[in-house]
């Protein structure tokens, strides 16, 4: 189950981060890994593995840790200062337009096209027209050519916004 809010979504107007970590708020803000108490007088630690906060903040609660869905692998666990990092399993990818699920990468390019990019956790294989070199629009044809691709190795983790 993915959290629906990130601290970026909730971020108040930016203020300079206080330099010293203290148990009471500094300039009205609590350090990463904490949230502010109901009366605004204390900084309360987030619960490791359950919730987190990434920035100096005056949030009244910490944000829920993301749980990686089936079809995803956990690249790094949730800490009090950083959300879980999930990544699509090999052979699948997550598109910006449909970030809620990992989709299977195509196994090959349509007729008249050549593969120029591998399947990665954040992109499908990339196909271009043999002659023009222009990219394929993305719709998967009913019948694919036998040009196949092996799943690409991840270059860098795609961090879920939660």
């Amino acid at each position: 189950e993915s959290a629906l809010i990130t601290q970026q979504d909730l971020a108040p107007q930016q203020r300079a981060a206080p330099q010293q970590k203290r148990s009471s708020p500094s300039e009205g803000l609590c350090p990463p890994g904490h949230h502010i108490s109901e009366d605004g007088r204390d900084c309360i630690s987030c619960k490791y593995g359950q919730d987190y906060s990434t920035h100096w903040n005056d949030l009244l609660f910490c944000l829920r840790c993301t749980r990686c869905d089936s079809g995803e692998v956990e690249l790094s666990p949730c800490t009090t200062t950083r959300n879980t990092v999930c990544q699509c399993e090999e052979g699948t990818f997550r598109e910006e337009d449909s970030p809620e699920m990992c989709r299977k990468c195509r196994t090959g390019c349509p007729r008249g096209m050549v593969k120029v990019g591998d399947c990665t956790p954040w992109s499908d294989i990339e196909c271009v027209h043999k002659e023009s070199g222009t990219k394929h629009s993305g719709e998967v044809p009913a019948v694919e050519e036998t040009v196949t691709s092996s799943p690409g190795t991840p270059a860098s983790p795609c961090s879920l916004s939660g």
């Epitope: 809010i5 909730l10 009205g28 009366d39 949030l59 009244l60 609660f61």
Partner: antibody, heavy 122, light 112 residues
Framework: EVQLVQSGAEVKKPGASVKVSCKAS????????MNWMKQSPGMSLEWIGR????????FYNQKFKGKATLTVDKSTSTAYMELSSLRSEDTAVYFC???????????????WGQGTLVTVSS | DIVMTQSPLSLPVTPGEPASISCRSS???????????LHWYLQKPGQSPQLLIY???NRFSGVPDRFSGSGSGTDFTLKISRVEAEDVGVYYC?????????FGPGTKVEIK
């Protein structure tokens, strides 16, 4: 347009319970606290408590603990307040109102429901 | 709990004239973060309250600039520079510096 639409007036007998609803629209329901206020006839306002739809935490005014129970149904963006063991002094107009998730801006209410009159009478 | 008092409790006004409402708190509303969490609402007849001013002097969006808030510590004032007929209703001050948040008794503004 942000709107909070509350359920209609209720008449209840002493000892009964009542559940008032507040349907939110025009904003992300899980992005704000939902607060509840009591306004007794000809009287001022009292803050009852608030519900956090994001993590389902509640925070009550000590005075209303045991009297009010706050819940939400995220699938319909509706907040509820149940009042139990009703007495004549619970007769009031009850308002829902939203507030921000931050301490610095969380203590005032930018949008309010139209109010629900609860009358307790034998 | 913090007790909020308002004066006057009733204020007859003349359209076009200024009006002023006072609000006092039983303790200072200056938070340890140096902000003051004192807010003003107007409840027009038959309506729900609407936010006018937050944190002493900040006008909420859409609130006419004839409304202004001032004050510090325990003493606060809401001023209407030129009262209009639509300004009638009950004005409440409210504090969120101390839990639980509390409201004043209200000041009823009506046209003379």
């Amino acid at each position: 347009e942000v709107q909070l639409v509350q359920s209609g007036a209720e008449v209840k007998k002493p000892g009964a319970s009542v559940k008032v609803s507040c349907k939110a629209s025009g904003y992300s329901f899980i992005g704000y606290f939902m607060n509840w206020m009591k306004q007794s006839p000809g009287m001022s306002l009292e803050w009852i408590g608030r519900f956090n739809p994001y993590n389902e935490d509640t925070f009550y005014n000590q005075k209303f603990k045991g009297k009010a129970t706050l819940t939400v149904d995220k699938s319909t963006s509706t907040a509820y307040m149940e009042l139990s063991s009703l007495r004549s002094e619970d007769t009031a107009v009850y308002f829902c109102a939203r507030s921000a998730y931050y301490f610095d801006s969380g203590g005032y209410f930018d949008y309010w429901g139209q109010g629900t009159l609860v009358t307790v009478s034998s | 709990d913090i007790v909020m008092t308002q004066s006057p409790l009733s204020l007859p006004v003349t359209p076009g004239e200024p009006a002023s409402i006072s609000c006092r708190s039983s303790q200072s509303l200056v938070h340890s973060n140096e902000n003051t969490y004192l807010h003003w609402y107007l409840q027009k007849p038959g309506q729900s309250p609407q936010l006018l001013i937050y944190k002493v002097s900040n006008r909420f969006s859409g609130v006419p600039d004839r409304f202004s808030g001032s004050g510090s510590g325990t003493d606060f004032t809401l001023k209407i520079s030129r009262v209009e007929a639509e300004d009638v209703g009950v004005y409440y001050c409210s504090q969120s510096t101390h839990v639980p948040w509390t409201f004043g008794p209200g000041t009823k503004v009506e046209i003379k």
